[in-house]
């Protein structure tokens, strides 16, 4: 990550509020804890595929299997959540595809929040057929481990039948679960055999047991709730972007920087420049000029378009993104060819001091 001195006449303070541009959103794959997940890298003509998670190289291990264009995660856990990328390296270029993995169960027990289908779980028996409690929909009870982001709503269900109609009560960690045990209490919908906790917090973690009983017997089922805590994080930039580019003198070129951020990102496009004939300041750091930044008068800040380029435009272009929490930056090189040479997409160019304009 480069260090630099900003050229004095390009300081951006105070910043203007960013425009409401759309921050790129990758495709999201959702898995429940314990499930296996398989994702195919959606890139064509891939000679070699490499994988990253949250910008860090991903290799095979006892739960992660990489076969050709497929990534398999066995027995997913919330720690597998994150921003994944597969990069296809070809003979002339490379391309990256991004996707999110979210291992969670926001509305639990295999049901939607509205309980629209719950009525059929309330089974009425012929009054002559006495029967101990039994589960009527075990599919909705298969997931025992529920990892839920803080502040989400959790629902546990134990659809049951019996004659006479059983009653249902809930235990937390083996003890009677009382309303005063959590701020905001909880809801029990007996007709839907459900327990609902809104806006969960870390203290809600634990084992929740439904006990369903009538005079002929008792059955129970236990769910484990884990509350995944959230905090704001620094921006993440899509690997491989901006990409190196080349064009002829007088041509046009575009650099793209894709940003994933959960706090307002400020995007800057920066280039090495000279000041008083020098590329470096007294501190030895290069002078850099802000070409574009997110703000009121700036259109899509994720794209830097250069028109009618000259040889002086050649060099390194840095996409620098910051939010209140931290920064990220990546760079690409622009090669400007004489008019007679045809432009083409370049391979990655290794930066060297001699390459500066």
């Amino acid at each position: 990550r480069p260090s630099f001195s900003l050229v004095e006449d390009t300081t951006l303070e105070p910043e203007e509020p960013p425009t409401k541009y759309q921050i790129s959103q990758p495709e999201v794959y959702v898995a429940a804890p314990g499930e296996s997940l398989e994702v195919r890298c959606l890139l064509k003509d891939a000679a070699v595929i490499s994988w990253t998670k949250d910008g860090v190289h991903l290799g095979p291990n006892n739960r992660t299997v990489l076969i050709g264009e497929y990534l398999q995660i066995k027995g997913a856990t919330p720690r597998d959540s994150g921003l994944y990328a597969c990069t296809a390296s070809r003979t002339v270029d490379s391309e990256t595809w991004y996707f999110m993995v979210n291992v969670t169960d926001a509305i639990s027990s295999g049901d939607d929040e509205d309980d629209t289908d719950g009525a059929e779980d309330f089974v009425s028996e012929n009054s002559n057929n006495k029967r101990a409690p039994y589960w009527t929909n075990t599919e909705k009870m298969e997931k025992r481990l529920h990892a839920v982001p803080a502040a989400n709503t959790v629902k546990f269900r134990c659809p049951a039948g019996g004659n006479p109609m059983p009653t249902m009560r809930w235990l937390k960690n083996g003890k009677e679960f009382k309303q005063e045990h959590r701020i905001g209490g909880y809801k029990v919908r007996n007709q839907h055999w459900s327990l609902i906790m809104e806006s969960v917090v870390p203290s809600d973690k634990g084992n929740y047991t439904c006990v369903v009983e009538n005079e002929y017997g008792s059955i129970n089922h236990t769910y484990h709730l884990d509350v995944v805590e959230r905090s704001p994080h620094r921006p993440i930039l899509q690997a491989g972007l901006p990409a190196n580019a080349s064009t002829v003198v007088g041509g046009d070129v575009e650099f793209v920087c894709k940003v994933y951020s959960d706090a307002q990102p400020h995007i800057q496009w920066i280039k090495h420049v000279e000041k008083n004939g020098s590329k470096y300041g007294p501190d030895g750091l290069p002078y850099l000029k802000v070409l574009k930044h997110s703000g009121i008068n700036s259109s899509n800040a994720e794209v830097l378009a250069l028109f009618n380029v000259t040889e002086a435009d050649a060099g390194e272009y840095i996409c620098k993104v910051s939010n209140y929490i931290g920064q990220a930056n990546q760079s690409a090189w622009l090669t400007v060819l004489p008019k007679q040479q045809a432009p083409g997409r370049e391979k990655e160019i290794t930066a060297s001091p001699d390459y500066l304009e």
Epitope: R1, P2, P18, P232, A263, S322, N323
Partner: antibody, heavy 113, light 108 residues
Framework: QVQLVQSGAEVKKPGESLKISCKGS????????IHWVRQMPGKGLEWMGA????????TYSPSFQGQVTISADKSISTAYLQWSSLKASDTAMYYC??????WGQGTLVTVSS | DIQMTQSPSSLSASVGDRVTITCRAS???????SNWYQQKPGKAPKLLIY???NLQSGVPSRFSGSGSGTDFTLTISSLQPEDFATYYC?????????FGQGTKVEIK
């Protein structure tokens, strides 16, 4: 665990210099801004500025530009706030914060003749 | 600079009350809005809500945030004894990252 530990309280005379510190631990110090916030006695919070330790990128509130200097030494995971010439009006509690979520305990600076 | 104006500057409430504090920005600070902090005497501020409505880890669910554009609200659904403190909003969209002047919540 993740924490920021600030240097102890200081009592100084007007015109003296001072450098207070904020040491981070339990996380990657270079990956988060360190913000400095002033709170004068009985008053509210004022954002002074911030530094990104990885590359020493620094930004100041116009109200504090030229009045203080923010720096960092990433090799020892420490950020600094310094004054070259203190004034009585600098008397305040100074907090450092990692982003928004982790705050130091504060350093009380008293400037009095 | 973007000014953040909080109201009221102080309020008296009882345990169990629903408390609402508002913060108005001098200009639109969408799309990623404001933070809310709680501060008790002699203590550092504590982050409650980030980006207007996201509950910070470990913060009780009785705290919630809402709003967009220029108007933001912190709500405490049922005031608890430990909630008597001063609350600050902050915008983190544009330098300088300004705070509101604070709202002191006192016992009635």
């Amino acid at each position: 665990q993740v924490q920021l530990v600030q240097s102890g309280a200081e009592v100084k005379k007007p015109g003296e210099s001072l450098k207070i510190s904020c040491k981070g631990s339990g996380y990657s110090f270079t990956n988060y801004y360190i913000h400095w916030v002033r709170q004068m006695p009985g008053k509210g919070l004022e954002w002074m500025g911030a530094i990104y330790p990885d590359n020493s990128d620094t930004t100041y509130s116009p109200s504090f530009q030229g009045q203080v200097t923010i720096s960092a030494d990433k090799s020892i995971s420490t950020a600094y706030l310094q004054w070259s010439s203190l004034k009585a009006s600098d008397t305040a509690m100074y907090y450092c914060a990692r982003g928004a979520d982790i705050w130091g305990q504060g350093t009380l600076v008293t400037v009095s003749s | 600079d973007i000014q953040m104006t909080q109201s009221p500057s102080s309020l008296s409430a009882s345990v169990g009350d629903r408390v609402t504090i508002t913060c108005r920005a001098s200009q639109d600070i969408d799309p990623y809005l404001s933070n809310w902090y709680q501060q008790k005497p002699g203590k550092a501020p504590k982050l409650l809500i980030y980006d207007a409505s996201n509950l910070q880890s470990g913060v009780p669910s009785r705290f919630s945030g809402s709003g967009s554009g220029t108007d933001f609200t912190l709500t405490i659904s049922s005031l608890q004894p430990e909630d008597f403190a001063t609350y600050y909003c902050q915008q983190t969209t544009s330098h300088p990252y300004t705070f509101g002047q604070g709202t002191k919540v006192e016992i009635k």
